[in-house]
Interface confidence: medium
């Protein structure tokens, strides 16, 4: 014969556990059910009679099977800085996330407590590495050869065009300027033939090192709008 | 996070020399860039120096320039600063900051979450 399926309540055998979805309650001594998720146990079980669940209440949430008598509230309304990617319903709680351009300076259990807007890299300097939802915008100067000209949390240094004949060297900040040489035969009429990068890559010039101090290779930095309150410059 | 410790700090007469240390622990590979900051009495904070590990690139505010030198060494992930011919406006807290500002190529000095250590006295006498 099959074994005898027991209802809730029902006492345990000596020794052995409540089944899934069941929880062993001390004052009845006995197994009863748990309430599903989006409910709460509004009575609890006796020796004769099993819990009663009900509805979680607005802005309210549970998560699990469980007993609790009374449901979690759902965390405040996402801040300005965050955007709600899962809402608040009766089974699970709201969750905030950074919004684009920021990071989560403070995560909590689920989502993030504080947000931080992504650093930008100013001229002179690119993204070593970008931003992630958890982690903040890392700058690295731009390289001999290299340059941004903007002030970015995305644009990494790009490398110097190389021209035929160079107007403008190009630094840190500074894309190289080319010559425009005076137009060659035409192959078709009205043509005409302006200068052409050459390759993506261009010599580097150096500023004026400093006595003493220089290392062997120096950065131009630019001055921008509101130069800080130190120099600054490339050693 | 990165915590930084800063030593090396005290008070030493004008045209006298300092060796300020920075002892890095934690995180220190987010921390491509390294630097110290000063604060005068009543004065805001000022960037002195900063360096980026694996380049040559390094700054140093005018104020300094040919007295002051920065330095690292990655194996016991200390930063130093060697301060020569020192003067009295050179007194004040000086403070190791890690991948920080304006310095360290970022478009503003207002990041709270950057680490700081807790600073060393520098006090120069005339």
């Known amino acids: 014969l099959p074994a005898q399926v027991a209802f809730t309540p029902y006492a345990p055998e000596p020794g052995s556990t409540c089944r899934l979805r069941e929880y062993y309650d001390q004052t009845a001594q006995m197994c009863c059910s748990k309430c599903s998720p989006g409910q709460h146990a509004k009575v609890f079980c006796t020796k004769t009679s099993d819990t009663v669940c009900d509805s979680c209440e607005d802005s309210t949430y549970t998560q699990l099977w469980n007993w609790v008598p009374e449901c979690l509230s759902c965390g405040s309304r996402c801040s300005s800085d965050q955007v709600e990617t899962q809402a608040c319903t009766r089974e699970q709680n709201r969750i905030c996330t950074c919004r684009p351009g920021w990071y989560c300076a403070l995560s909590k259990q689920e989502g993030c407590r504080l947000c931080a807007p992504l650093r930008k890299c100013r001229p002179g300097f690119g993204v070593a590495r970008p931003g992630t939802e958890t982690s903040d915008v890392v700058c690295k100067p731009c390289a001999p050869g290299t340059f941004s000209n903007t002030t970015s949390s995305t644009d990494i240094c790009r490398p110097h065009q190389i021209c035929n004949v160079v107007a403008i060297p190009g630094n840190a900040s500074m894309d190289a300027v080319c010559t425009s040489t005076s137009p060659t035969r035409s192959m078709a009429p009205g043509a005409v033939h302006l200068p052409q990068p050459v390759s993506t890559r261009s010599q580097h010039t150096q500023p004026t090192p400093e006595p003493s101090t220089a290392p062997s290779t120096s950065f131009l930095l630019p001055m921008g709008p509101s130069p800080p309150a130190e120099g600054s410059t490339g050693d | 996070q990165v915590q930084l410790v800063e030593s090396g700090g005290g008070s030493v007469q004008a045209g006298g020399s300092l060796r300020l240390s920075c002892a890095a622990s934690g995180h220190t590979y987010r921390s491509n860039c390294m630097g110290w900051f000063r604060q005068a009495p009543g004065k805001e904070r000022e960037g002195v120096a900063a360096?980026?590990?694996?380049?040559?690139?390094?700054y140093y505010a005018d104020s300094v320039k040919g007295r002051f030198t920065i330095s690292q060494d990655k194996a016991k992930n200390t930063l130093y600063l060697v301060m020569n011919n020192l003067k009295p406006d050179d007194t004040g807290v000086y403070y190791c900051?890690?991948?920080?500002?304006?310095?360290?190529?970022?478009?503003?000095?207002?990041?709270?979450?950057?680490?700081w250590g807790q600073g060393t006295q520098v006090t120069v006498s005339s």
């Open positions: 360096m980026y590990t694996g380049t040559d690139w390094k």
């Open positions: 900051a890690a991948d920080f500002g304006f310095i360290c190529g970022y478009d503003s000095d207002d990041d709270p979450y950057d680490a």
